[in-house]
């Protein structure tokens, strides 16, 4: 999970001590430090809500707090990735949306958040202590997953606050994607810190700013998402598993919100903007070595295929390989 450190409140140096130049060189290391701590570590939040009108109906909302291009979202229930779960929906920004019962409708709310409506009765119906997980595959961050569930005492109609799940796995792609920039910055930071070793350290005081305080990020998440960042995370083991579904590896996917105007529905661009297959099968979304994509098989011990990403935006036939030949 991204460290919740924010830009420390720097006390200005004593008047006349260093002058304008010194002031800048003092601020720069701390900015770089914040970047080193926060950059490249996106976050996923999950919110589960039981509808007041239908007690068997749930709405799951998930969001990705990162600056990369989302290339796949997978929503599952029954546990986090690798812990045994069943895929409810897979959303791909270009190739579409697929959901499985009891999921009724999956959609994009924004370019980086999705919602899923579940409804059912009997064995396939979700219940209050079911754990729902969302996995976002993005470039360059890699795959990030979070889980959440309704608190046992939740009243219908109320929702658990968005849960910033600790990232279960920061895949290699995410690390490599930002390492170049960060390495340079951090080396420079160390250099600056070494230069300032002999000088009095600036006084720091804990940041008392709200979650809306600026972060080292190119854009600001919604207030709801931001407010969620300080909510403790807990995975509640589910005793309410769909009786009709065997255990499977959990995994999720993305889709565009139905009401988004076209001009707002910009699809993710970049090398990972489209997962061209080989295609994972439903049910398991296990990150492969490059940390970008995965496999999906419905139920263990089956494991699905590896999913390869290709940069060609023209689609499934735009590259060589199984999907590249017409």
């Amino acid at each position: 999970m991204r460290t919740e450190a924010q830009v420390p409140a720097l006390q200005p140096p004593e008047p006349g001590l260093e002058g304008a130049m010194g002031h800048r060189t003092l601020v720069l290391p701390w900015v770089l430090l914040t970047l080193c701590v926060t950059a490249g570590t996106p976050e996923v939040w999950v919110q589960v809500r039981m509808e007041a009108t239908e007690l068997s109906s749930f709405t799951i909302r998930c969001g990705f707090l990162g600056s990369g291009s989302i290339s796949l979202v997978t929503v599952s229930w029954g546990g986090p990735n690798g812990a045994g779960g069943t895929t409810l929906a897979v959303l791909h920004p270009e190739r579409g949306i697929r959901q499985w019962a009891p999921a009724r409708q999956a959609r994009w709310e924004t370019q980086s958040s999705i919602s899923l409506i579940l409804e059912g009765s009997g064995a396939s119906s979700p219940c209050a202590n079911t754990t729902f997980c969302c996995k976002f595959a993005s470039f360059p961050e890699g795959s990030w997953e979070a889980c959440g569930s309704l608190p046992p005492s939740s009243d219908p109609g109320l929702s658990a606050p968005p849960t910033p799940a600790p990232i279960l796995r920061a895949d290699l792609a995410g690390i490599l994607g930002v390492s170049g920039v960060l390495l340079f910055g951090c080396v420079y930071l160390l250099h600056l810190l070494r230069r300032h070793k002999h000088r009095p350290a600036p006084r720091l005081q804990p940041s008392r700013t709200s979650p809306q305080a600026p972060r080292a990020r190119a854009w600001a998440p919604s207030q709801a998402s931001q407010a969620a960042l300080h909510v403790p995370y807990a995975t509640i083991n589910t005793s309410c598993r769909p009786a009709t579904l065997d255990t499977a590896h959990p995994h999720g996917g993305p889709s565009w919100w139905a009401s988004l105007p076209t001009h707002a529905a910009h699809r993710p661009q970049g090398p990972a903007a489209w997962a061209s297959t080989p295609i994972p099968a439903r049910g398991s979304f296990v990150s492969v070595e490059n940390g970008l994509y995965a496999q999906a098989g419905e139920r263990p011990p089956h494991t699905g295929p590896g999913l390869t990403l290709f940069p060609d935006p023209r689609g499934p036939r735009a590259m060589e390989g199984p999907l590249g030949v017409r």
Epitope: L72, E94, G96, T277, P278
Partner: antibody, heavy 119, light 107 residues
């Protein structure tokens, strides 16, 4: 080269059943769901359902539940569709099609199998 | 289920002409609309998905547009190999449904 080779044409009597096959080659069989599509003579396309080759899990169009049964044999990279209680309404060309993630587009198609139901 | 309505059902045109086929969805499908081309006696082939993304080897004279519920496929400067039937399909959840098809014939 990706190929989906379907079994030959079938002429069957009303009330009977028929099982048609679709053998996949040129890609990893478990990398795609196998969809089945019906095309009645001179008409449009209807999605029957699909099967996950990893475990045989199926999804059906409500219209074809009870009519079609989809299965796979991973060892031979072959998908099957059985149609039962056939009537003249079931006379059509049936296609298998490989669907890539998230399994809602038909990326590759078999050549089709013609099923004629006639007494 | 999402219903897909295509028009016109048939269309006659000459080589070199430009034609437009339309497809309407019964509910909002965002940009998740695909087009398939089927030549006489052959299997359908995926042509376009996500409204306007052309699959490999599809000539640039084909272009898709639209969003929400209204979509169209435009073919500029028709070539002999473009004649056949065209089907739209939403890829916004299941069941997958197709339009009734448009038969493009040589005038």
């Amino acid at each position: 080269e990706v190929q989906l080779q379907q079994s030959g044409p079938e002429l069957v009597k009303p009330g009977a059943s028929v099982k048609i096959s679709c053998k996949a080659s040129g890609y990893t069989f478990t990398d795609y769901y196998m969809s089945w599509v019906k095309q009645s003579h001179g008409k449009s396309l209807e999605w029957i359902g699909d099967v996950n080759p990893n475990n045989g899990d199926t999804s059906y169009n409500q219209k074809f539940k009870g009519k079609a049964t989809l299965t796979v044999d991973k060892s031979s990279s072959t998908a099957y569709m059985e149609l039962r209680s056939l009537t003249s309404e079931d006379s059509a060309v049936y296609y298998c099609a490989a669907s890539g993630l998230p399994y809602v587009l038909m990326d590759y198609w078999g050549q089709g199998t013609s099923v004629t139901v006639s007494s | 289920d999402i219903q897909m309505t295509q028009s016109p059902a048939s269309l006659s045109a000459s080589v070199g002409e430009t034609v437009t086929i339309t497809c309407r969805a019964s509910e909002n499908i965002n940009s998740y609309l695909a087009w398939y081309q089927q030549k006489q006696g052959k299997s359908p082939q995926l042509l376009v998905y996500n409204t306007k993304t052309l699959t490999e080897d599809v000539p640039s004279r084909f272009s898709g547009s639209g969003s929400g519920t209204q979509f169209s496929l435009k073919i500029n400067s028709l070539q002999p190999e473009d004649f056949g039937s065209y089907y739209c399909q939403h890829h916004y959840g299941t069941p997958l449904t197709f339009g009734g098809g448009t038969k493009l014939e040589l005038k």
